[in-house]
């Protein structure tokens, strides 16, 4: 029997972000549930992490007296990421002088758990999503985004931090996963592959997408990122897969057209404010959700991941620009900046829609292999 596609009856479309290609699938095996070491041999296409204090430069951790109320997802201590032994060494991040806490990279020593023990945790991200095993949770309501349509001024900082391109977001972008689950957006960044090689972090039934966007949020229950790290629900990331489509995506073009200016590692530029929600799929009601971690050191757990069912379409030229413009340290291209998928270790991925059933009309009450645990909590 055909495996259901994630997209199924939810055509991509609406705004500049969606098209009606469903999320693809591939009959690739996934060792999602088998415990294993961080990024073991044979793990996915390429391991990696990002730059938050695990998810791309989380806001700077500063004494409260400094820049209060101005969270910058950036410059936290970072560590090296391990490589995938089955993949060519990704030299996007060459070793630098200095202690292990000063940086990390995709591919290579030291193993991430050695420099950030949380990276060896049992509930890490990213993961492989199997729609048929997802627990349908009707209590998962459509996401609510407020203040994401930014005016052109003030401008925003776009930075090549050596392992991703990151856009720092201003105060005022509010997101709710549900009643009482409120967050503030801090930054967004992307993960990508290389020519002919996909680079999303999450996978769907083993299928890796060309790229993935992450919008990182801090719970309103916390004033600072360092307070939220490792706390259940302290951070939340909205993730969407980027796919190739026939037309240029004008929302993404506002960022991609500026990448040449920040080709060099550590460089940054300013870009006009834009509609951040236009970078995401238009359907906020259909998504997968689970508790995981930052995908880069320090790999802090307790992060609520929301992965959209609908994908975002970019042109082939745009995807090429994304994967072929930026440079990391040591004269190496910044490519394949994703971490290998991690085992679920008993976690259940929840779905806001009946993802595990064929969309063709059948039983009114489809049987789900997993039951909803969250109850919208």
């Amino acid at each position: 029997q055909r495996l259901p596609r994630m997209q199924e009856d939810s055509p991509l479309g609406g705004g500049s972000s969606g098209e009606d290609d469903p999320l693809g699938e591939e009959d690739l095996p996934s060792e999602e549930d088998s415990p294993r070491e961080e990024d073991p041999p044979g793990e996915e296409d390429l391991p990696g992490e990002e730059d938050l204090p695990g998810e791309e430069d989380l806001p700077e951790v500063k004494p409260k007296s400094e820049e209060e109320g101005s969270l910058k997802l950036e410059d936290l201590p970072t560590v090296e990421a391990p490589g995938d032994p089955q993949e060519p060494q990704n030299n996007a991040h060459r070793d630098k002088e200095g202690d292990d806490q000063s940086h990390w990279r995709y591919g290579g020593d030291p193993p991430w758990p050695r420099v950030s023990p949380a990276c060896a945790g049992r509930f890490q991200s990213p993961v492989d999503i199997r729609p048929q095993l997802a627990a349908f949770c009707p209590a998962l309501r459509p996401l609510e985004l407020l203040g994401f349509q930014l005016p052109p001024l003030p401008e925003l900082r776009l930075r090549n931090n050596g392992h991703s391109v990151q856009l720092t977001l201003p105060p005022g972008l509010e997101m709710a996963l549900g009643p009482g689950r409120e967050y503030r957006a801090l930054q967004l960044h992307l993960h990508w592959g290389a020519a002919g090689r996909p680079g999303s972090e999450h996978t769907v039934e083993g299928h890796r997408f060309p790229a993935e966007i992450h919008v990182v949020h801090l719970s309103t229950a916390f004033a600072r990122v360092d307070e939220a790290l490792g706390r259940p629900g302290g951070l939340a990331v909205l993730a969407a897969f980027l796919e190739e489509g026939p037309e240029e995506n004008s929302a993404y073009e506002q960022l991609l057209s500026r990448l040449e200016e920040i080709a060099e590692e550590g460089s940054e530029t300013q870009v006009p404010g834009l509609d951040i929600s236009a970078l995401l799929p238009s359907d906020f009601s259909r998504y997968f959700q689970y508790e995981g971690s930052l995908t880069t050191p320090p790999c802090a757990q307790g992060v609520i991941w929301t992965v959209f069912n609908q994908t975002v379409m970019l042109s082939a030229k745009q995807l090429h620009t994304l994967s072929d413009t930026l440079w990391g340290p040591g004269d190496s291209r910044l490519q394949l900046n994703f971490r290998a998928t991690q085992p679920l270790n008993g976690r259940v991925i929840e779905a806001s829609f009946p993802a595990g059933v064929d969309s063709s009309p059948r039983a009114a009450e489809p049987v789900q292999l997993n039951s909803c645990l969250a109850a919208g909590d």
Epitope: S16, Q149, P151, P152, L153, P154, E155, S250, Q254, Q270, V271, P272, L274, D275
Partner: antibody
Amino acid sequence: EVQLVESGGGLVQPGGSLRLSCAASGFTFTDYYMHWVRQAPGRGLEWVAFIRNKASGYTPQYSASVKGRFTISRDNAENSLYLQMNSLRAEDTAVYYCVRGGHAGSNYWYFDVWGKGTTVTVSS
Amino acid sequence: DIQMTQSPSSLSASVGDRVTINCHVSQNINVWLSWYQQKPGEAPKLLIYQASNLHTGVPSRFSGSGSGTGFTLTIRSLQPEDYATYYCQQGQSYPFTFGQGTKLEIK
């Protein structure tokens, strides 16, 4: 009174250089993005370059047609804006306007104060 | 770059007429559009900002409307001093671009 006064225009040969100046008065100069906009004879308006305000680090931005040839700068102590034009071409012939646009309270770029303009003619 | 197309390129109208000038934008710019008036030998002057806000000192017969990709400048009752060329400009992202202009002439 808010005022912008340009100077430095003139006749120059192709490949030559020219430096335009703009004296600003009547407002807090450092708060504003400052632009150069040009208008070729009988033609429409073309944005050339801007330099950001203090809050945004005084960094420049250029149109593709002048990038690498023109340099915008400002002297905040003197409330002055400059446009250094090198490798001039016939198509750079235009009236050059110094323009104020965008500040800490703005939410987009509109050009609310214009100078009278200074004429640059590039011809052999 | 964002393309701006004004229509008509020129028009003739009489004093007291209601005049509308259109500006079509190649992509969604929300309301980040301005209108300018330029008389021969003078610098442009800002009339309307953020699609519909009247700039200080501009007569109330001028108004602007629209959002997204379609915008309109309206002069409710044309006055002799209104004969000029009008430009729209997007302030969504650089390079900032202007329409090609609409020349308003006396009928």
